[in-house]
């Protein structure tokens, strides 16, 4: 599931990561819009390990994947905010 | 070349355990996630454990999870599989492979194989 | 979990054939699929990944292709060689292979 979220919590991540995830082992994507106490945007993943990981947004893959995931739920959701299982 | 030299299959009881190894040589062992895959006598291939390149992340399916570990050691360019309490069902020839490039944004799957090792359970 | 049936299970074809395997997912796997090859005895081989994609080395006659929940693995013409057994594997939510495809000598 890819989610976006507008929360009025403070930043979520502690230490991010930009160690690449294969999409296969992904359960879901959180994405945290920067604002609202919080001057950056947040990715978190949730691994089909059950761990949990926050992404550095700058990371290639990941910007890669975000933009796959937009292109494919753009035709069929609103934007920003969308939930959709990793196609 | 890339090569890849299992170890440590043999006969054990049910319940019994196993810890098998894959010795890997001609690439960057610590720079690529790596897998085990099995095969029990004339089936089909089916997926154990996967592990990311740096060691801290596992990822098994439902029928080993619980009893089977995988771990590696990059200082020693080796990969492992603990197998605790074996079936009759894990019965199998134990492929250790070459996995997705942990450094990269691709989703390549499992590459490289080994020729695989043995392991009879059996009473 | 996903699901891969492939067919058909077996198949006997003549040197020169062409021969069509196909694998249908139980949900959409996004071209995330691979195509071994194995001998008896062997390790299996790695021929295509993301449902078309060529690994290095692999001769041209074999192609893959497909979308959404269906996949198809050709090879334009048998070469003796070829005679084994074929796995699809899909990799886009964990990992599942087909049942497998034996390929023999008609």
């Known amino acids: 599931v890819l989610e976006v979220y507008y929360t009025s919590l403070r930043c979520r991540c502690v230490q991010e990561s930009s160690v690449f995830i294969p999409r296969r082992f992904i359960d879901r994507i959180q994405i945290l819009p920067r604002g609202n106490g919080c001057p950056r945007k947040e990715i978190i993943v949730w691994k089909k390990n059950k761990s949990i990981v926050c992404v550095d947004p700058q990371a290639e893959w990941i910007q890669r994947m975000m933009e796959v995931l937009r292109k494919r739920s753009s035709s069929t959701l609103p934007v920003p905010v969308f939930k959709r299982k990793i196609p | 070349e890339v090569q890849l030299v299992e170890s440590g299959g043999g006969l054990v009881q049910p319940g019994g355990s196993l810890r098998l190894s894959c010795a890997a040589s001609g690439f960057t062992f610590s720079s690529y996630a790596m897998s085990w895959v099995r095969q029990a006598p004339g089936k089909g291939l089916e997926w154990v454990a996967t592990?990311?390149?740096?060691?801290?992340?596992?990822y098994y399916p439902d029928n080993v999870k619980g009893r089977f570990t995988i771990s590696r050691d990059n200082a020693k360019n080796s990969l492992y599989l603990q197998m605790n309490s074996l079936r009759a069902e894990d019965t199998a020839v134990y492929y250790c492979?070459?996995?997705?490039?942990?450094?990269?944004?691709?989703?390549?799957?499992?590459?490289?194989w080994g020729q695989g090792t043995l392991v009879t359970v059996s009473s | 979990d996903i699901q891969m049936t492939q067919s058909p299970s077996s198949l006997s074809a003549s040197v020169g054939d062409r021969v069509t395997i196909t694998c249908k997912a139980s949900?959409?796997?996004?071209?995330?699929i691979a195509w071994y090859q194995q001998k008896p005895g062997k390790a299996p081989k790695l021929l295509i990944h993301y449902t078309s994609t060529l690994q290095p080395g692999i001769p041209s006659r074999f192609s893959g292709s497909g979308s959404g929940t269906d996949y198809t693995f050709t090879i334009s013409s048998l070469q003796p060689e070829d005679f084994a057994t074929y796995y699809c594997?899909?990799?886009?939510?964990?990992?599942?292979f087909g049942g497998g495809t034996k390929l023999e000598i008609k």
């Open positions: 492979a070459r996995d997705y490039y942990g450094s990269g944004y691709e989703d390549s799957p499992m590459d490289y």
């Open positions: 949900q959409d796997i996004n071209k995330y």
């Open positions: 592990i990311s390149d740096g060691g801290s992340d596992a």
């Open positions: 594997l899909q990799y886009d939510n964990l990992y599942t």
